[in-house]
């Protein structure tokens, strides 16, 4: 298993509707063909997997129907998207990355975004 | 085990005002969201708001503005729900159910619900 | 406001038959929604989350598909419990709309 370098933003701010994106940039050491990535989440010292896709370059990723996430790629960069947050889903939110095919198997992580999500103040059909 | 427990049946007269209580147990209350659902007799499910308990936050629906509120408290873990301007339309069964953060793993939505509380009003 | 809209609201169908329920939503609510079955007299029960999500401990019979703006409830094997009022929900934000209900009994 060789390390390599995953960047992604420090910070930010889900929208009203509880949607948040941010890019997940990777050094890619090599030509990968296959690669898979990794949201997971940091919150109270537990990290669970909110969600993962594998892609071959060029190509959409494809998470799961029931995903509440979705991404494109470009390059060695993902653009993902979370929907439904609320606030109880605030946390940092870390992205992994492995360069699945061909060998050698890379992995990197970054360092997290800190994803905020605020409960709307109530007014009519607001999003909560 | 998860248990939800909401407070017994009521009757009201017709611009009074009622709370139902709905108790927590078996679980991190200010882990989960709570909803309040209700149900007319023989009609179907209509969903009246949320509350974060670990923040008091709410939304209602719109039909609610301004006449219902969701409180909770922590100390008890439960959660309230109060109706007022009461009209023979709110004639209901009354439920709360919980809802975890959607990134909670396993967590399903509305997954336990209290046993309802029937409010009746009537003249 | 968004509107769910099932189909059909009422259906009578035998033992062991395989029974289908739609949901229709008015936007796109990607896979957030809800289904649950609701026995006469008794506290709905959740069936399926997130379009196809099986809650724990229901029966294998009862599966969820869909996205956007049309889903499904499939009952592969009608069963005499299964006699309830079925709902759909959408759980992406408030207002968490829940369709009409479709009141299934057996022939």
């Known amino acids: 298993c060789k390390a390599m370098h995953v960047a992604q933003p420090a910070v930010v701010l889900a929208s009203s509707r509880g949607i948040a994106s941010f890019v997940c940039e990777y050094a890619s050491p090599g030509k990968a063909t296959e690669v898979r990535v990794t949201v997971l989440r940091q919150a109270d010292s537990q990290v669970t997997e909110v969600c993962a896709a594998t892609y071959m370059m060029g190509n959409e990723l494809t998470f799961l129907d029931d995903s509440i996430c979705t991404g494109t790629s470009s390059g060695n960069q993902v653009n993902l998207t979370i929907q439904g947050l609320r606030a109880m889903d605030t946390g940092l939110y870390i992205c992994k990355v492995e360069l699945m095919y061909p060998p050698p198997y890379y992995l990197g992580i970054g360092n997290g975004t800190q994803i905020y999500v605020i409960d709307p103040e109530p007014c009519p059909d607001s999003d909560f | 085990q998860v248990q939800l427990v909401q407070s017994g049946a009521e009757v009201k007269k017709p611009g009074a005002s009622v709370k139902v209580s709905c108790k927590a147990s078996g679980y991190t209350f200010t882990s989960y969201y709570m909803h309040w659902v209700r149900q007319a007799p023989g009609q179907g499910l209509e969903w009246m708001g949320i509350?974060?308990?670990?923040?008091?936050?709410?939304n209602y629906a719109q039909k609610f503005q301004g006449r219902v509120t969701m409180t909770s408290d922590t100390s008890t873990s439960t959660v309230y729900m109060g109706l007022n301007s009461l009209r023979s339309e709110d004639t209901a069964v009354y439920y709360c159910a919980r809802d975890p953060p959607i990134t909670m793993v396993r967590g399903a939505p509305f997954d336990y619900w209290g046993q309802g509380t029937l409010v009746t009003v009537s003249s | 406001d968004i509107q769910l809209t099932q189909s059909p609201s009422s259906l009578s169908a035998s033992v062991g038959d395989r029974v289908t329920i739609t949901c229709r939503v008015s936007?796109?609510?990607?896979?957030?929604l809800n289904w649950y079955r609701q026995k006469p007299g008794d506290v709905p029960e959740l069936l399926i989350y997130r379009s196809s999500n099986f809650q724990s401990g229901v029966p294998s019979r009862f599966s969820g598909s869909g996205s956007g703006t049309d889903f499904t409830l499939t009952i592969s094997s009608l069963q005499p419990e299964d006699v309830a009022t079925y709902y759909c929900q959408r759980t992406y934000n408030a207002p968490y709309t829940f369709g009409q209900g479709t009141k299934l009994e057996i022939k």
């Open positions: 936007q796109d609510i990607s896979s957030f």
């Open positions: 509350v974060n308990p670990s923040s008091g936050s709410t």
